[in-house]
Interface confidence: low
């Protein structure tokens, strides 16, 4: 069957009639429905949630809508027993302490369940020493510290602020440096922006504001108890003691009005350099300890969080492909959120409600799409991305199979400047030609295209007349279907300007006060921003499952690896002489992108020419670019990471949030003029540049003639 | 604030049953966790049953499964405890308790900090 014969609507018409039906109004309706109390994972208000949107996904025609559930490990604080930290006298007496909760926004006083600021996941603990400034607690921090200015970190408390990493990197690495206890904290450097009001009155963060988030350091593993394997009724699951990237040092977060108190004392060295100074009126001195008057004061922290296991509940929804049911496209992002969610994630479910429905009408004037969609509702992202990798665990079988692309929808805004994507670069071309035929919502820009917008706001710095697209790292539910099964995926979202607002994500991540009236209010009133964020990921999903051909591009891969294959080598040359006495050459990586760059384009050329009438060279071909993704996939995975197994790309084992090209290659060489061992430093470098060069070259040949 | 009171207490023969009730009024939003405490003379309060807001969480005790149920009626904001089979070891002054949701596993345990009408008294005797 042609796609045609699937439906009673041209496809020209098909996209216009899907596209047309998306409303800016009911995306407004669907978040304040989803933000009116909080949902936090593991809670009964996210399941009645669930539940609702199972109702509602019905009603707007999916062909099935079911529960899955699982029981994970999840982090709550102790209800009797809140966590907080104190300045102590010498006498032991706490002669200051922070705050136990957020100041609740106007309208939502009396609002039960708020959880209060947690960093979910820190072992109970009640430390007590002198604090260390850290910065950001970054790797380049902690080297700053102990190799020039021979600070040493163990036994000490050590207090950083959020922004520029996920913020399980930096407890990692202070946990590394020897520290007893981590606090964390928003400065308004990175979470005032410059000239606006705080909630309520604009949307930067207030002193009393604080950044909840987990801690962990899974690296893709899912629920911490049962990695590889789905938290299921039957699960074995592993000690507390074994389980998987628990921090070992109790940690919490405050805000700046008590960060100032902690800060203001600080003693020891100045700090080393202006990047080191937030916009607090403190000195920034880096310690160890209080200054003179304060010397024999302490910093005590107190948590009593526990690890619980608990249920969660993802709702999948399913529109059956007419012509290819075996093949899947995949819309998903996350419902549960820390308070309300106004922001993350509700934003990006209320996008994924309404293109359900747009769906859902089409499929009840007898339109269907070519390919089956799967729509999906996670649970316990902010737990560690558990509800998408427990469901892509138990389903991966079909999954590694049938997966033709998974598109990400948590928050659909983090600014209203313009559009941001990062996607594998199969989908590049896909982007480019859906965004040239939407108009853009920017004032300046009526009557243009949002590829024009796009482009003029957010350049690409390689290729002029483009727009910038960033390389997925993680810190979100596409993690597993693209890390670990090779699922080619991409994901879209309205974004600030990066050149004069460099504050890490938005001010109100995570906070109580990331509210409906928060988007209403200051982000996006009219809701265009969001209307365009639902046309860009449900046109990405339409033309996923519905064109005839698969709308990847293999040769965009090709234009990449070269790419990423001359930085990694340039990394490398910063060391000429040990390349030289170990005998590290990139010849045989640099061999496997030309055989693949050559490969590609006689595949797109092929992929012109054929018969599309024929439907078993129809499913071959597209099953050859259904499975390139896949071939990038190495069973063993990273060194250490098993369950990152891309070999094109993996989150920097700096920053979760970031993606990095040729990782096996890129951590082999990172700092390798410290290592111990320089022989076996550099034969680790020669055994991932010849993993990279057959992975690519394995890869290659999938895109060859099969017989 | 909110504010629980409970009756169909009373005196009944072994063997026989009673059907307790517990009306919540005031501020009932986000109360999503009721159940029922009971207190024997001398004794510690102990845990009977919980139920979560959607009815889809039930936890019975022990000592008291097979033979109490507990049930909820959202419509009229009403928690319901249907005792059979009564034995003496049931007597006891009957709380019904009321949370906000404590996070997690332990959903289901109820403490000073949350609501508790003020009891009614169950005897079970020949």
């Known amino acids: 069957k042609s796609s045609n014969e699937a439906t009673n609507i041209t496809p020209k018409h098909n996209m216009k009639a899907f596209l047309d039906e998306l409303k800016a109004e009911n995306i407004k309706k669907f978040l304040y429905n989803f933000t009116q109390i909080p949902h936090l994972a593991g809670t009964e208000q996210n399941f009645q949630l669930a539940k609702q949107i199972q109702s509602q996904w019905k009603e707007f025609g999916l062909d099935s809508v079911e529960l899955a559930h699982y029981d994970v490990l999840l982090s709550y604080p102790n209800k009797t027993h809140p966590n907080y930290i104190s300045i102590i006298n010498e006498d032991g007496n706490e002669i200051f302490n922070t705050s136990l909760f957020e100041p609740p926004p106007p309208g939502y006083e009396n609002v039960s369940d708020i959880v209060p600021p947690f960093s979910a996941f820190s072992p109970q603990g009640m430390p007590e020493g002198d604090l260390v400034y850290v910065n950001y607690a970054r790797t380049e921090d902690f080297f700053k510290l102990e190799r020039d200015m021979k600070i040493n970190c163990s036994g000490k408390i050590v207090i950083a602020r959020y922004g520029k990493v996920f913020r399980g990197n930096k407890v990692k690495n202070a946990q590394l440096a020897g520290a007893k206890g981590v606090i964390l904290y928003s400065d308004p450097a990175d979470y005032f922006a410059p000239g606006v009001k705080s909630y309520p009155d604009g949307w930067n963060l207030p002193g009393g504001g604080v950044q909840r988030g987990n801690i962990l350091n899974l690296n893709g593993a899912g629920d911490p108890l049962t990695p590889g394997y789905p938290a299921n009724e039957y699960a074995y699951r592993r000690g507390i003691a074994e389980a998987v990237g628990l921090p070992s040092i109790p940690v919490h977060p405050i805000g700046y009005y008590d960060a100032q108190k902690l800060l203001e004392k600080m003693g020891g060295s100045a700090p080393p350099d202006s990047s080191w100074r937030g916009s607090l009126k403190v000195p920034y001195n880096v310690g160890p300890g209080f200054t003179g008057n304060f010397s024999t004061q302490k910093v005590k922290m107190h948590i009593h969080s526990t690890n619980e296991v608990t249920r969660i509940y993802n709702v999948i929804g399913t529109l059956r492909g007419a012509v290819e049911p075996d093949r899947y496209v995949i819309l998903g992002g996350h419902r549960d959120s820390w308070v309300f969610g106004g922001i993350d994630p509700q934003s990006g479910a209320a996008v994924v409600h309404e293109i359900v429905r747009s769906f859902g009408t089409l499929k009840k004037e007898g339109w269907r799409p070519r390919r089956t969609i799967l729509f999906a509702s996670w649970d316990a992202e902010e737990f560690g991305l558990l509800g998408s990798t427990e469901w892509a665990e138990e389903n991966s079988r079909l999954l590694q199979e049938r997966g033709v692309a998974y598109i990400n929808a948590d928050s659909s805004i983090e600014g209203n400047y313009t559009l941001r994507v990062d996607c594998t670069p199969l989908m590049y071309s896909l982007v480019h030609n859906l965004t040239k035929e939407l108009k853009s919502p920017d004032e300046g820009f009526e009557g243009k295209s949002l590829y024009e917008s796009w482009t003029k706001k957010s350049p690409s710095p390689e290729f002029s007349g483009m727009p910038r697209i960033s390389k997925l790292g993680s810190g979100n539910d596409f993690e597993v279907f693209f890390q670990r099964l090779g699922i080619a995926s991409g994901r879209a979202r309205y974004t600030k300007n990066w050149e004069t607002n460099k504050f890490s994500g938005y001010p109100l991540y995570h906070s109580v006060y990331e509210t409906y009236e928060l988007v209403e209010k200051f982000y996006d009133p009219m809701f265009k921003y969001h209307l365009t964020v639902a046309q860009v990921r449900g046109g990405m999903v339409f033309e996923l499952a519905n064109s005839i051909v698969l709308p990847f591009d293999c040769r965009d891969y090709a234009v990449v690896l070269r790419k990423y294959a001359d930085k990694i080598y340039s990394i490398s040359m910063k060391h000429p002489q040990e390349m030289k006495t170990y005998s590290v050459s990139f010849d045989s990586l640099f061999s496997a992108v030309k055989n693949f760059t050559e490969i590609a384009s006689k595949f797109s050329e092929r992929l012109q020419d054929f018969d599309k009438s024929n439907p078993i060279v129809l499913r071959m071909m597209n099953d050859q670019l259904m499975f390139l993704e896949r071939a990038f996939i190495d069973p063993l995975g990273l060194p250490d990471r098993p369950f990152y197994r891309h070999v094109i790309y993996a989150p920097s084992s700096h920053n979760k949030y970031a993606g990095e090209s040729f990782p096996g290659i890129y951590d082999a060489l990172f700092d390798i003029e410290s290592k111990v061992d320089p022989s076996k430093a550099w034969g680790e470098v020669k055994r991932q540049i010849y993993v990279a060069a057959f992975t690519v070259q394995a890869a290659a040949e999938t895109l060859s003639e099969v017989a | 604030q909110v504010q629980l009171v409970e009756s169909g207490g009373g005196v009944v023969q072994p063997g026989r049953s009673l059907r307790l009730s517990c009306a919540a009024s005031?501020?009932?939003?986000?109360?999503?966790?009721m159940g029922w405490v009971r207190q024997a003379p001398g004794k510690e309060r102990e845990f009977v049953a919980a139920?979560?807001?959607?009815?889809?969480?039930?936890l019975v005790s022990d000592s008291v499964k097979g033979r109490f149920t507990i049930s909820r009626d959202n419509s009229k904001n009403t928690l319901y405890l249907q005792m059979n089979s009564l034995r003496a070891e049931d007597t006891a002054v009957y709380y019904c308790?009321?949370?906000?949701?404590?996070?997690?596993?332990?959903?289901?345990?109820?403490?000073?900090?949350?609501?508790w009408g003020q009891g009614t008294q169950v005897t079970v005797s020949s």
């Open positions: 005031g501020r009932t939003f986000g109360i999503y966790v």
């Open positions: 139920i979560s807001w959607s009815g889809s969480d039930r």
């Open positions: 308790a009321a949370s906000n949701r404590l996070y997690g596993r332990t959903w289901y345990d109820f403490n000073e900090s949350d609501y």
